[in-house]
Amino acid sequence: GGGGAAPTETQPPVTNLSVSVENLCTVIWTWNPPEGASSNCSLWYFSHFGDKQDKKIAPETRRSIEVPLNERICLQVGSQCSTNESEKPSILVEKCISPPEGDPESAVTELQCIWHNLSYMKCSWLPGRNTSPDTNYTLYYWHRSLEKIHQCENIFREGQYFGCSFDLTKVKDSSFEQHSVQIMVKDNAGKIKPSFNIVPLTSRVKPDPPHIKNLSFHNDDLYVQWENPQNFISRCLFYEVEVNNSQTETHNVFYVQEAKCENPEFERNVENTSCFMVPGVLPDTLNTVRIRVKTNKLCYEDDKLWSNWSQEMSIGKKRNST
């Protein structure tokens, strides 16, 4: 609530401020206009979160935010007669929402998800410190292309980590990747505090490994041609090409930002294919090539998750040791 009487020039406070949760992590505040607002006032609403973050002045009587409900979050709302930020709004009314109850030590930790090849999402977590070893976990997820919250069925265990994976295919709709997946993990018995996470679809993307199609020598240059993982266009990927030479026992790594197949030596117009020329390679020795890829910042927020390495391909001949 507010405090003190409002100065005469300010509007009365908004009424009926309430808060609700939709989906898993969409928090919505709604309110009614102030009672007794002056008739010559075109009402605008000033709002910000408890820590004075995300100030907004808008005519709508609602505000929403996508936030993992692991901590209490509060919104303060006031009314004013213009969009001017320097105008003093009415007394601010505050409404908070708290996370579900439970022992914080029981909540799972390190809840994170990776979108594998834009086709399925794999989430994993560690049990909370204060939980029973036989806890049965359930993961729920929601994103915009789903009508309702879904329960993840494929729970697995990898060492101390638990996890679950679910299908999530990139939709041709251009705005799909501007959205997020909302995640919640709790236990079947309701003993642990639920944990939430929001996974932006432009981050934590791990492509499948590429597939090497062709290696060929032209003079002392090695031409490498490969097929990129499905669902990715080549300009959205960054490449690492590793070449090992058996004779010199050298291990060369090339970081490739653009991998166009423009050289006449490359097979051209092959869809989703990339190419790179490795200079100064000895053709009469055995050279083994492998490649991995990751998303780049042209198309994605995150560029940290490398794919696994491709299968190796070799060219040249192994010299007899005499």
Partner: antibody, heavy 118, light 107 residues
Framework: EVQVLESGGGLVQPGGSLRLSCAAS????????MTWVRQAPGKGLEWVST????????YYADSVKGRFTISRDNSKNTVYLQMNSLRAEDTAVYYC???????????WGRGTLVTVSS | EIVLTQSPDFQSVTPKEKVTITCRAS??????LHWYQQKPDQSPKLLIK???QSFSGVPSRFSGSGSGTDFTLTINSLEAEDAAAYYC?????????FGQGTKLEIK
């Protein structure tokens, strides 16, 4: 075979530093927390520090907080314990252990002796 | 933090005897208690997890029981190779704590 092997112990003066390493093999390293436990000569076991499999969660005993730093390199299957501002009471055999399930230690190394003395 | 108190501190026993070591927690820890054995000049080894579950490869003469605050490690028909120090450990929250240890000597 699942095993862990400590190294880096030795004699150091009070106030000095030492870095212990623990090399692991035979299991998927990044899926398991690793822990350091120490044992002063003729005494019992004392938990020192734990780091989760992906390195996001790190815990220390009050007796070493602010002086010791645990870290891991999952590409090298190795966990480290950087020990600064060492004191005589830090003298102990330091064991590295793999953590399993709900926090029990199923694999232990042979230990490495750290002696803090002038 | 959880304080674990073992008893006895020391026990001298003859082979084939039954040995009982107890561990009392300062507050309820459910089944978050594990037992370790440490033979002279060796590193500790896990014997019992979650108060009563035998760890793989541990001889069947070792068993554990209890929950909450009172726990017991039992060695049925003691063998000479069981001469060691035995420690209980709590994993109910942090810090992990160990009991002070029970040293078992074979007569």
């Amino acid at each position: 075979e699942v095993q862990v092997l400590e190294s880096g112990g030795g004699l150091v003066q009070p106030g000095g530093s030492l870095r212990l390493s623990c090399a692991a093999s035979g299991f998927t390293f990044s899926n398991y927390a690793m822990t350091w436990v120490r044992q002063a000569p003729g005494k019992g076991l004392e938990w020192v520090s734990t780091i989760s499999g992906r390195g996001y969660s790190i815990y220390y005993a009050d007796s070493v907080k602010g002086r010791f730093t645990i870290s891991r390199d999952n590409s090298k299957n190795t966990v480290y314990l950087q020990m600064n501002s060492l004191r005589a009471e830090d003298t102990a055999v330091y064991y590295c252990a793999k953590e399993e399930g709900h926090w029990y230690f199923d694999v232990w190394g042979r230990g490495t002796l750290v002696t803090v003395s002038s | 933090e959880i304080v674990l108190t073992q008893s006895p501190d020391f026990q001298s026993v003859t082979p084939k005897e039954k040995v009982t070591i107890t561990c009392r927690a300062s507050q309820s820890i459910g089944s978050s208690l594990h037992w370790y054995q440490q033979k002279p000049d060796q590193s500790p080894k896990l014997l019992i997890k979650y108060a009563s579950q035998s760890f793989s490869g541990v001889p069947s003469r070792f068993s554990g029981s209890g929950s909450g605050t009172d726990f017991t490690l039992t060695i049925n028909s003691l063998e000479a190779e069981d001469a060691a120090a035995y420690y209980c450990k709590s994993s109910a929250g942090l810090p992990y704590t160990f009991g002070q240890g029970t040293k078992l000597e074979i007569k």
